[in-house]
Amino acid sequence: AGLLLIVSPSHPTEGSPVNLTCKMPSLQSSDAQFQFCFFRDDQALGPGWSSSPKLQIANMWKEDSGSYWCEAQTMASKVLRSWRSQINVHRVPVADVSLETQPPGGQVMEGDRLVLICSVAMGTGDITFLWYKGAIGLNLQTKTQRSLTAEYEIPTARESDAEQYYCVAENGYGPRPSGLVSITVRIPVSRPILMVRAPRAQAVVGDVLKLHCEALRGSHPILYWFYHEDVILGSSSAPSGGGASFNLSLTAEHSGNYSCEANNGLGAQRSEEVTLNFTVPTGARSNHLTS
């Protein structure tokens, strides 16, 4: 009677271990007198010849499918060979593909790192992950790896990254797409510019000055604060587009430095100061404004 190769489990799933046991026929003497070797498709496995009749393959992959057998060699160099056993490694198709973001919720500040994490709930073997952008499905990146998650990184997010994204996972059983994820790029305010508008070239006490503050860039809403010598005059909100204005009735005390600040919750930016001076021309009863 020949050797017997026992495979456990007989129908392994990818990524799981398999135990091979080379069983001696009962009429043979003790295993201790033998050296054992396991083979797949004419290739020796593991350590080659060994005194152990057992071999564990820690992770079986689809490409490990094949014809397995074992051999035993006596002290007298007589070689016994088992029948071949066909081992077919079962691949689990990918399922439940999802796309998540870091930071969570799909909101990222301009300039910050954005990571799109593609995950599968199940699936074995080499999984190919693909990331797509926008309705037209522009392929951003493709990665093949033996893991249930893969990442696509945008090191510094820009407005052009504010789009819809999805990913696709595939391991030989057809592509499986995730749902769409919308990315919002939040833009901190740029440094605003303060403009002073007077009703005439030389404003006088009693005139109404219009202070207009405008940041070129920044996600809305933007709150604008107006300052005279670092004292708050007032504030105004711009819910969408454009800047904000503040009306000021001139008095003699209104000479000095003016500035404004823009804040949209992502940080505040202060404008350069604008200096407004009142001069009292000789014999004149009114103060004039120059900037």
Epitope: E159, S160, E163, R191, P192
Partner: antibody, heavy 119, light 112 residues
Framework: EVRLVESGGRLVQPKGSLRLSCAVS????????MYWIRQAPGKGLEWVAR??????????YYADSVKDRFTISRDDSQSMLYLQMNNLKTEDTAMYYC??????????WGQGTTLTVSS | DIVMAQSPSSLAVSVGEKVTMSCKSS????????????LAWYQQKPGQSPNLLIY???SRESGVPDRFTGSGSGTDFTLTISSVQAEDLATYYC????????FGAGTKLDLK
């Protein structure tokens, strides 16, 4: 493929008017702020006007040198950007570029259209 | 306005040489919100439109060769070309977008 194609530049007399156009394709035009940037012959680059997206109320911004003379506008349905220029001066002579604003830097430029203001 | 000063105004180089050019701003371009420097570099070849090379002072635009490197922070910035190629002969502009945009006067790169 992203394309920005300007047109409308020509020789105009001082105090005259002209409208420049820019036809855009290859990206979602209505989500981006757009600029007109100019370059006088042998000189550097100068921003002229900016218009934000509909989400931002089509807010417009102008360089001091063109304020109250130039008007920037857009037609998202046609993916078109415009620059209406009135009361033109000789110093407005330049190559005018239609440009996409991507987080403050300018990642796509048209080939430019030439405006010459001369009597 | 934020003033951008570029130096040198022109530079004669040989193919294969390493080149550095400077850009200085009149105010810091480092944004407190995200610690990014709001500065870009452009290349303009004769008779062509400008082309974005670098944004946020050091991020290379897609498709730009890795011989182009941007560095610096605050008010002092540098564009380095590690090994100049014939096709790099152009004028290079820096631009700030911390506030209303302003450009430097440019650095013209010529062959020796």
């Amino acid at each position: 493929e992203v394309r920005l194609v300007e047109s409308g530049g020509r020789l105009v007399q001082p105090k005259g008017s002209l409208r420049l156009s820019c036809a855009v394709s290859g990206f979602t035009f209505n989500t981006y702020a757009m600029y007109w940037i100019r370059q006088a012959p042998g000189k550097g680059l100068e921003w002229v006007a900016r218009i934000r997206s509909k989400t931002n109320n089509f807010a417009t911004y102008y360089a001091d040198s063109v304020k109250d003379r130039f008007t920037i506008s857009r037609d998202d349905s046609q993916s078109m950007l415009y620059l209406q220029m009135n009361n033109l001066k000789t110093e407005d002579t330049a190559m005018y570029y239609c440009v996409r604003d991507n987080s403050g830097s300018f990642d796509y430029w048209g080939q430019g259209t030439t405006l010459t203001v001369s009597s | 306005d934020i003033v951008m000063a570029q130096s040198p105004s022109s530079l004669a180089v040989s193919v294969g040489e390493k080149v550095t050019m400077s850009c200085k701003s009149s105010q810091s371009l480092l944004h407190s919100s995200n610690q990014k420097n709001y500065l870009a570099w452009y290349q303009q070849k004769p008779g062509q439109s400008p082309n974005l090379l670098i944004y946020w002072a050091s991020s290379r635009e897609s498709g730009v060769p890795d011989r182009f490197t941007g560095s610096g922070s605050g008010t002092d910035f540098t564009l380095t070309i590690s090994s100049v190629q014939a096709e790099d002969l152009a004028t290079y502009y820096c631009q700030q977008y911390y506030s209303y945009p302003t450009f430097g006067a440019g650095t013209k790169l010529d062959l020796k």
